[in-house]
Each structure stands twice: as C-alpha cells, then as structure tokens.
C-alpha cells in the first residue's frame, strides 16, 4: 500500500476501513472497484460485486470521489450517488448524492470531480454502492476515482 | 485555535493531527502552508518545507481543499494533487487528484474549489505534499485553501 | 437511521457525532437543519436554531455539503461557509468556505455542489453554523445538502 508494506497489525482490534479505487472494466451500475492492487485498503469490511459489506454495526465515515471528463462537452447531466442496500429493506437508500448540470462549454474538452463524504449509522449486512449517471464519462485513475469508509 | 486557547492535553496519548492553511508566499511547488497562526493544528506530525512528515505508521485520513480564482477566465487546466514521497522509494506517489477543464466562461471573473479526502496507510518518514498546476490562480485565505490529516 | 433502528449503545462513552440534513423551511441565515427524521444522527452534541453546539472540548472533523441549482443560470456568485460563534468572542469565525463564480451557461438549467470538510479544535459552548449566499438556489434533499461532525 502506497509503495510500502502494510504496518504490522496493532494489538487492538483491527480497524474497519476501506479505500477502493477506480476499475475501468466497470460495464454497468453499480460501479466496480479495484480491491487488491495499488493504494487499496480493505480491512474488517468485505468487498462484493461493487459493494462494501458492513459486518459490524456502528458509525462510519463514508466517502467517494468520481472524476468525470469528456472530449466534446454536451452537458449531459451528471450524477454521483452513494447508496445502501439491505436485504431486510425493499428499496435502495441514497445516502449522499451530487449532481451537475451546465458545467462546461459546448464542444470543449472538459473535466470535473464530484466529492461526497459524511457519517452514517450502518448495520451489519448493509451493502454500500456507488452509482453514476454517465459511465462512459468516468475516468478510473486510482487517484481520481475512489470509494472508502472507516469505522469511527 | 479558532479564537480560543487549546484545551488541556487529554490523558491518553496525543492525537496525531494537522490542519494547515494557505500561505500566500508560496512561490513554487509543492505549496507551502501556514503552520503557526490562525486556525492551524499540528500535533504528533511535523511540518517541513511544504510537507507533513509522518512519524508513526498507521491509517490516516488525509484531506485538502484548494480555492482557484481569476479575473478573466481562459480555462487553463487546473490540477490539485496530494502526493507522497519517501526516501526509500524513487518516485512521488499521487494519492489523490482533482482536475478541472472548461469550467468558466471566457473573459469572466471566476472562482472554483477542489476538495480531496481519503484514508491511506502511511509509514513513518512518509512526506505528504500538495501540488497545483497554476499557482498564480490559487487564493490562500485560511478558510478556503487548506491541507490536513489525522490518524484514525 | 438509514432505514433501520440505531444499534444498541456501546459500552464505551457515547460517540459525539452529528449528521443533519437539509430543511426546506430555512428562511434566513444561518441555514436550518433536519435533526429528527431520516438519516439524521445527533449524539453527544446539541442542535439549536441552525447550530451544532459543542459540549466537550476537543478535536472534531466538521463537514458540510450544499447543493445549489437553478432553472435559468445567471451566474450569481455562490458562497458556502461553515462558521463558529462563541459568546466569549465578539465575531463569527469562518472555519471553511467555498465560493463559485462563472460556473454555468447563461440561461440554462444548472446544478452544482460545494463540499467542505476539515479538522478543528473546538471548545465547549462553541456553536457551528452553515451560511450560503443565495438561499433560493439551495436544494434541501437529505442526500444533497447536509452538515455534520464527529469527535476524533
């Protein structure tokens, strides 16, 4: 991680934390993430089919950044959502969301990021995902597009 | 800090934390930061020549905001990076990055911010820095441009 | 919270945390917030007339997101501030701020977010608020506009 081996585990219980980075073979929603290589972290939380799976109820800070870019700006509306799904509840719950409209000059090469981050009370078995409106406009560089959380 | 004296140190070990604010005498990259006056925090982490120096291996939430503005928009590409350097490794590692292109109307006065924040596994002696593409377009007000971290 | 009951309180002291969401009956500054329903969290911190009131001195990560949108862009300057007030001190202190100018195409429907987040040393009885420049341009959906903090 970040160019050097992980530190030895601390004596106290393992910190529940994740930092996943963009994976360019995402073909549909929710976004898929790199969970193994590069500056990735995954400890005390599982990754499954695009989602972070909570295994201990508690308070978590959840964050995501998505980097949108294009070559000939058409100002298609962009949205970036972090949402939660739990088998006990019928519907996805949107936790955080960012929207952009009219953000660049028609025809120009353009680039823009959306950042979300906040504290939530999560329950064991909650699945967290990231959704975007225009997959083809997302750039998946590990430093630009990411999704993470940590237990407070 | 924030208009009143620091609280007495807590019994438990000092929290490793930093919040540095914009310093307008930055002349080159990486950006330099105010580490003494105003709403600054620096505890258990060192500040050296623009960088935050980690002295204890572990998990850290790292964040930065940069406020760009100009009198007459010409849509110069803007980038804002948080990167890491360690003497053991030959190359800088970009941890987080934001880019903007085609973000304002040509000729107009404009203003825009870039925010970055995520969790990383850092090792003692890592140096963290912030880089921007257009130094002349950065405004260094303490509430607008900052760089910080805390150990989880 | 988030569609399921809060977890039973942990044995250790209650975590000081807040996540408040947009309240559309805000009529003036500072913004008012939903502190009861939906994905709201409020524990070990009080909410009073738009403000989060600190009752224990220490280090806090404070964040806010505001979602601005309009039907017909006229590029009114937008600002989003998190500020602090304490009866011992005469003046509000701006902790974090975001500004936007020249951000959309004249006459077009537009949407944009501002995100702020950083660590501060807060003292018991500090009151934290959020201010925006153009209240009529704020959308108060709970996933889009929020204000929170947690004690490190």
């Amino acid at each position: 991680q970040i160019g050097h081996p992980s530190p030895p585990p601390e004596k106290k219980e393992l910190r529940k934390v994740a930092h996943l980075t963009g994976k360019s073979n995402s073909r549909s929603m929710p976004l898929e993430w790199e969970d193994t290589y590069g500056i990735v972290l995954l400890s005390g939380v599982k990754y499954k089919k695009g989602g972070l799976v909570i295994n201990e109820t508690g308070l978590y800070f959840v964050y995501s950044k998505v980097y949108f870019r294009g070559q000939s700006c058409n100002n298609l509306p962009l949205s970036h959502k972090v949402y939660m799904r739990n088998s006990k509840y019928p519907q996805d719950l949107v936790m955080m969301e960012g929207k952009m409209m009219s953000y660049c000059t028609t025809g120009q090469m353009w680039a823009r990021s959306s950042y979300l981050g906040a504290v939530f009370n999560l329950t064991s078995a909650d699945h967290l995902y990231v959704n975007v409106s225009e997959l083809s406009l997302v750039n998946f560089e590990e430093s630009q597009t990411f999704f993470g959380l940590y237990k407070l | 800090q924030i208009g009143h004296p620091s609280p007495p140190p807590e019994k438990k070990e000092l929290r490793k934390v930093a919040h540095l604010t914009g310093k307008s005498n930055s002349r080159s990259m990486p950006l330099e930061w105010e580490d003494t006056y105003g709403i600054v925090l620096l505890s258990g982490v060192k500040y050296k020549k623009g960088g935050l120096v980690i002295n204890e291996t572990g998990l850290y939430f790292v964040y930065s905001k940069v406020y760009f503005r100009g009198q007459s928009c010409n849509n110069l590409p803007l980038s804002h990076k948080v990167y890491m350097r360690n003497s053991k490794y030959p190359q800088d590692l970009v941890m987080m990055e934001g880019k903007m292109m085609s973000y304002c109307t040509t000729g107009q006065m404009w203003a825009r911010s870039s925010y970055l924040g995520a969790v990383f596994n850092l090792t003692s002696a890592d140096h963290l820095y912030v880089n921007v593409s257009e130094l002349s377009l950065v405004n260094f007000e303490e509430s607008q441009t900052f760089f910080g971290l805390y150990k989880l | 919270q988030i569609g399921h009951p809060s977890p039973p309180p942990e044995k250790k002291e209650l975590r000081k945390v807040a996540h408040l969401t947009g309240k559309s009956n805000s009529r003036s500054m500072p913004l008012e917030w939903e502190d009861t329903y939906g994905i709201v969290l409020l524990s070990g911190v009080k909410y009073k007339k738009g403000g989060l009131v600190i009752n224990e001195t220490g280090l806090y990560f404070v964040y806010s997101k505001v979602y601005f949108r309009g039907q017909s862009c006229n590029n009114l300057p937008l600002s989003h501030k998190v500020y602090m007030r304490n009866s011992k001190y005469p003046q509000d202190l701006v902790m974090m701020e975001g500004k936007m100018m020249s951000y959309c195409t004249t006459g077009q429907m537009w949407a944009r977010s501002s995100y702020l987040g950083a660590v501060f040393n807060l003292t018991s009885a500090d009151h934290l608020y959020v201010n925006v420049s153009e209240l009529s341009l704020v959308n108060f959906e709970e996933s889009q506009t929020f204000f929170g903090l947690y004690k490190l």
Epitope: G70, S72, C73, L76, Q108, L137 | - | -
Partner: antibody, heavy 119, light 111 residues
Framework: QVQLVQSGAEVKKPGASVKVSCKAS????????IHWVRQAPGQCLEWIGV????????SYNQKFKGRATMTVDKSTSTAYMELSSLRSEDTAVYYC????????????WGQGTLVTVSS | EIVMTQSPATLSVSPGERATLSCKAS??????????MNWYQQKPGQPPRLLIY???NLESGIPARFSGSGSGTEFTLTISSLQSEDFAVYYC?????????FGCGTKLEIK
C-alpha cells in the same frame, strides 16, 4: 444503424440565408454533440461550430460568429445550421458529424449538402 | 488557432507498397498523456471517414494496414501495403481545443 441524413442541395443568391438540416437515427440523439464542417470546391475542410444536443447552446468558429446559427429539435432528433449573408465564397459542401463526448473524434458524418451561392 | 500542415500535397505510390503521410501542428496537441490527433480518409463525392483517433488508435472496421504514430506536433499515418481502395485524400485534424482545424490533405494517387 447510425445514420445522419442531410437535406438536399440548395442554390442561393448572395445576401440570402440557407438552413441545412441533419436528421439523426440509430442512436440516442442527445448523447452526442453535433459538429458542422464545410468543404469549398478543392479546398480544405473547415470547422464551423458545434452544438450541444442536450442543452441546445453552441460554440462557433470565430470566422462564422454572427453569421452561423445552430439549433436542435430534440423531438425529431434533428440538428440545423443556418448561414446568413451568403457570399460566393460560401459555396461549399456542408457536413454534419456526431462526436461522442467520451471519445476523440467525429465518428459518423452526414452525406453532405451542397450549397451554391450565385447571382 | 492551431494550424495543421500536411505533406506532401500529393503522394504517388504503387499498389502493395508502403505509404507514409505526415502532419505537423503549429503547437502541441498533447494533453495529459494523450495526443488529440485524428486521421480521415475521403473519396470523391463522399464524406470523410474516421480512420485513426488519438494519434494511434484504429477506428473499428478499419483494416489493420492503417496505423498512426507521433506525439506533440509531429504525426504520421502509415499504410503498410496499399490496396486499390486506399487511393483517396487523407486529412489530419486536431481535437485538442476549439476551433478544431484540419490539414489541407494529402492526395494519395496510383503511381
């Protein structure tokens, strides 16, 4: 399949205006910008401008600003380019082309519309 | 604006031989690791057809004998073994910024 079908040839007098249409089919019209390019006989290709099919606003080559007007009709998936104050040097074949925002180039072109300006 | 200069104006090559076409930009068309240079083929009475995008990427459906190279200001289109259907006019175009500009073309004719 993707098609951009342009309106037929036009003959105009100097000082008049011409409006060329470009009807798109086989894809989601509002997902791509439409660019207009012209080619005078034996001359280079010349970029006129681009319109957002989603938002309806346009960016023009400075050379054509004030004379060219681009519009779209989302309901019929049609883009239009009107050129006013025509002169003999505007005699050219006018092309529309779509440009995917996520790509690098104009990937599909209309068949072209010959506009002849002659007194 | 960026001026595109193509050379030669006309190139005479025999079928089966290799053709190399050049395009120079008045300033760099690179940004962030990509070269915003495209190549089109045009035959009489037809619209241009995209061959190569981003300097070296082959558009789908285009034969592998076409290839592009270069970066910054100097770019090349190569046709490894000319077929009869390849004799046409070839245009380079940048998409780095507005206004987009085209070269004035290289006419590839049968020797």
């Amino acid at each position: 399949q993707v098609q951009l079908v342009q309106s037929g040839a036009e003959v105009k007098k100097p000082g008049a205006s011409v409006k060329v249409s470009c009807k798109a089919s086989g894809y989601t019209f509002t997902d791509y910008t439409i660019h207009w390019v012209r080619q005078a006989p034996g001359q280079c290709l010349e970029w006129i401008g681009v319109i957002s099919t989603y938002q309806g606003d346009a960016s023009y080559n400075q050379k054509f600003k004030g004379r060219a007007t681009m519009t779209v009709d989302k309901s019929t998936s049609t883009a239009y380019m009107e050129l006013s104050s025509l002169r003999s040097e505007d005699t050219a074949v006018y092309y529309c082309a779509r440009f995917p925002d996520w790509d690098y180039a104009m990937d599909y072109w209309g068949q072209g519309t010959l506009v002849t300006v002659s007194s | 604006e960026i001026v595109m200069t193509q050379s030669p104006a006309t190139l005479s090559v025999s079928p089966g031989e290799r053709a190399t076409l050049s395009c120079k930009a008045s300033q760099s068309v690179d940004y962030d690791g990509d070269s915003y240079m495209n190549w089109y083929q045009q035959k009489p009475g037809q619209p241009p057809r995209l061959l190569i995008y981003a300097a070296s990427n082959l558009e789908s459906g285009i034969p592998a004998r076409f290839s592009g190279s270069g970066s910054g200001t100097e770019f090349t289109l190569t046709i490894s073994s000319l077929q009869s259907e390849d004799f046409a006019v070839y245009y380079c175009q940048h998409s780095r910024e507005l206004p987009y500009t085209f070269g004035c073309g290289t006419k590839l004719e049968i020797k």
